[in-house]
């Protein structure tokens, strides 16, 4: 607001006032009169730029007169009082109320004094973020969706991600006239490494005290990625039993594990227990390639591992190392 004047009277008002769609808002406007200065206010007038006539007038003798009596009201001006406060309340804010308004004091003998105020009509958006569940497409697809509904002005959406990718943002009219719904998609090439990771949608709007952060946990559906662990290339005869583990990553979770060998069914010393294969002690050297086949809703994948059980040197007491 302007600093107090030393001699002249000054109309004080903010340059911009925000109000929310459907709510009421007060356009503040005051006449500041220096200490010794005498002034007489005979009329307060509010008008809108680009429109002829006044929307609200308060006359020293006739009181208030409004272009829309149900929507306008002088907050403090009263008959029989010094007219120093021209603040005007507007009810049921509409989009078309946004614009420049002039508050004018008719004073004597100083003359007319006015100030312009920009009324911003805002609508606070509702924000949601959701995952877009995808499969391994091999090409960029939306993996997350962030929607800011019914904002005025449109919300600003940005994404934060360590996974790479790029946004695709679009706007559409909101449910209420003059509002905008902003939809932003986070697009990347899906991979199993992306599954379970998160991206953050940041929504900024002048009605917010601070940006809203919405985190989305990504879902990528992919067939099993399989490996077999538990063998260290140092298995010998007369050892304790050992275990091979079929390590499978998949989404959705594996529905079944099937163990076999390249020669067909499992030999007697190998016992399947779900994702694990129990290898019992053997009394003669073997050289067998085990196969673990993992199934989920998207398909089956397998891994192979060749296991050798060797004749160990007598000096080594250790048996088949189990993991």
């Amino acid at each position: 607001w302007p600093p107090p004047g030393t001699g002249d009277i000054i109309v004080q008002a903010p340059t911009q006032v925000p109000g929310f769609l459907g709510d009421s808002v007060t356009l503040p406007c005051y006449l500041q009169v220096p200490g010794m200065e005498e002034t007489h206010v005979s009329q307060l007038t509010w008008s809108r730029h680009g429109e002829s006539g006044s929307m609200a007038v308060f006359h020293q003798t006739q009181g208030p007169n409004y272009s829309e009596p149900k929507r306008l009201e002088f907050v403090a001006a009263r008959l029989g009082t010094e007219l120093r406060d021209a603040s005007l309340r507007m009810f049921g804010l509409r989009v078309e109320d946004e614009g420049n308004y002039t508050c004018l004091f008719v004073t004597f003998p100083q003359g007319s004094r006015s100030v312009d105020i920009w009324l911003r009509v805002l609508a606070k958006p509702q924000n949601t973020a959701e995952v877009q569940k995808v499969q391994l497409t091999g090409k960029p697809v939306p993996v997350a969706r962030c929607v800011s509904t019914g904002g005025r002005p449109p919300a600003h959406i940005t994404w934060h991600s360590d996974l790479g990718g790029m946004p695709n943002t679009s706007q559409a009219p909101g449910f209420l006239s003059g509002t905008v719904t902003v939809t932003s998609l986070w697009i990347l090439v899906p991979s199993s490494q992306v599954d379970g990771k998160s991206v953050t949608c940041k929504v900024e709007h002048e009605s917010f005290e601070k940006p809203q952060l919405l985190t989305v946990n990504l879902t990528v559906y992919y067939p099993p990625e399989v490996s077999i662990s538990g063998y260290d290339n140092n298995w010998y005869l007369s050892q304790n039993e050992a275990t091979l583990t079929c390590d499978a990553r998949s989404n959705p979770e594996p529905t079944g594990y099937n163990w076999s060998t390249t020669m067909g069914p499992l030999p007697p010393f190998a016992v399947a227990q779900g994702a694990q294969l129990l290898i019992r002690p053997v009394d003669k050297p073997i050289n067998t390639t085990f196969i673990c086949n993992v199934t989920n809703a998207l398909g089956a994948r397998q891994a192979e591992l060749t296991v050798q059980v060797k004749e160990g040197p007598p000096s080594e007491p250790s048996g088949m190392s189990s993991n």
């Epitope: 004047g5 030393t6 001699g7 002249d8 220096p34 010794m36 200065e37 005498e38 007489h40 005979s42 009329q43 006359h59 020293q60 003798t61 029989g80 008719v106 004597f108 003998p109 100083q110 003359g111 007319s112």
Partner: antibody, heavy 121, light 110 residues
């Protein structure tokens, strides 16, 4: 046609009072500011007071506080100034003036012809 | 109370530009003094010319203009005419009252 019709000349004795009138026409009286001015023969003008006709709100030159009282009668669109405890120093022409607005500022717009007051024993 | 001083008399010729000034005893005249200029012709015929320092009254010829020049209020007549011969008073506002100057008698030699 805008007019400010002032009452006729007054010859009064020292110590007496006089009430001058200024009948207006041709404009909205209730939203008018009217000033009263004094001019002694061959001299400058002296501002006495203004009154806002709509409410009767007034503002006086401190020099004339207690000496002059300005009032209005909205029903007849007439402004009055009563001068009391008259002395020979009060002998002068008294003008009523309606202020006009240029929008940004006010000016001394419409002048009455003046009322001559002579104070003499 | 403040004293407002004007040139007592000025002379000009038709078509010439003449400037009348108005000085305040309290210091520089500012826009907060809302300078007024009034013309008086014989038989006490008064006309308000300027209000609020530089706002010309409706119907007043454009050759009359008000301004601040230095620390004084000024009335400039650009291209004076013989009918402009008159007494010109300035009035300044001092927070709660007007004070008139002594007036300038302008003669337009024709």
């Amino acid at each position: 046609q805008v007019q400010m019709q002032q009452s006729g000349a007054e010859l009064v004795k020292p110590g007496a009072s006089v009430k001058l009138s200024c009948k207006t026409s041709g404009f909205t009286f209730s939203s008018s500011y009217i000033s009263w001015l004094k001019q002694k023969p061959g001299q400058s003008l002296e501002w006495i007071a203004w009154i806002y006709a709509g409410t009767g709100d007034t503002n006086y030159n401190q020099k004339f506080t207690g000496k002059a009282q300005v009032t209005v009668d909205t029903s007849s669109s007439t402004a009055y100034m009563q001068f009391s405890s008259l002395t020979t120093e009060d002998s002068a022409i008294y003008y009523c003036v309606r202020h006009g607005s240029t929008g940004r500022g006010w000016y001394f717009a419409v002048w009455g012809a003046g009322t001559t007051v002579t104070v003499s024993s | 109370q403040a004293v407002v001083t004007q040139e007592s008399a000025l002379t000009t010729s038709p078509g010439e530009t003449v400037t009348l000034t108005c000085r305040s005893s309290t210091g520089a005249v500012t826009t907060s003094n809302y300078a007024n200029w009034v013309q008086e012709k014989p038989d006490h015929l008064f006309t308000g010319l300027i209000g609020g320092t530089n706002n010309r009254a409706p119907g007043v010829p454009a050759r009359f203009s008000g301004s601040l020049i230095g620390d004084k209020a000024a009335l400039t007549i650009t291209g004076a005419q013989t009918e402009d011969e008159a007494i010109y008073f300035c009035a300044l506002w001092y927070s709660n009252h007007f004070v008139f100057g002594g007036g300038t008698k302008l003669t337009v030699l024709g």
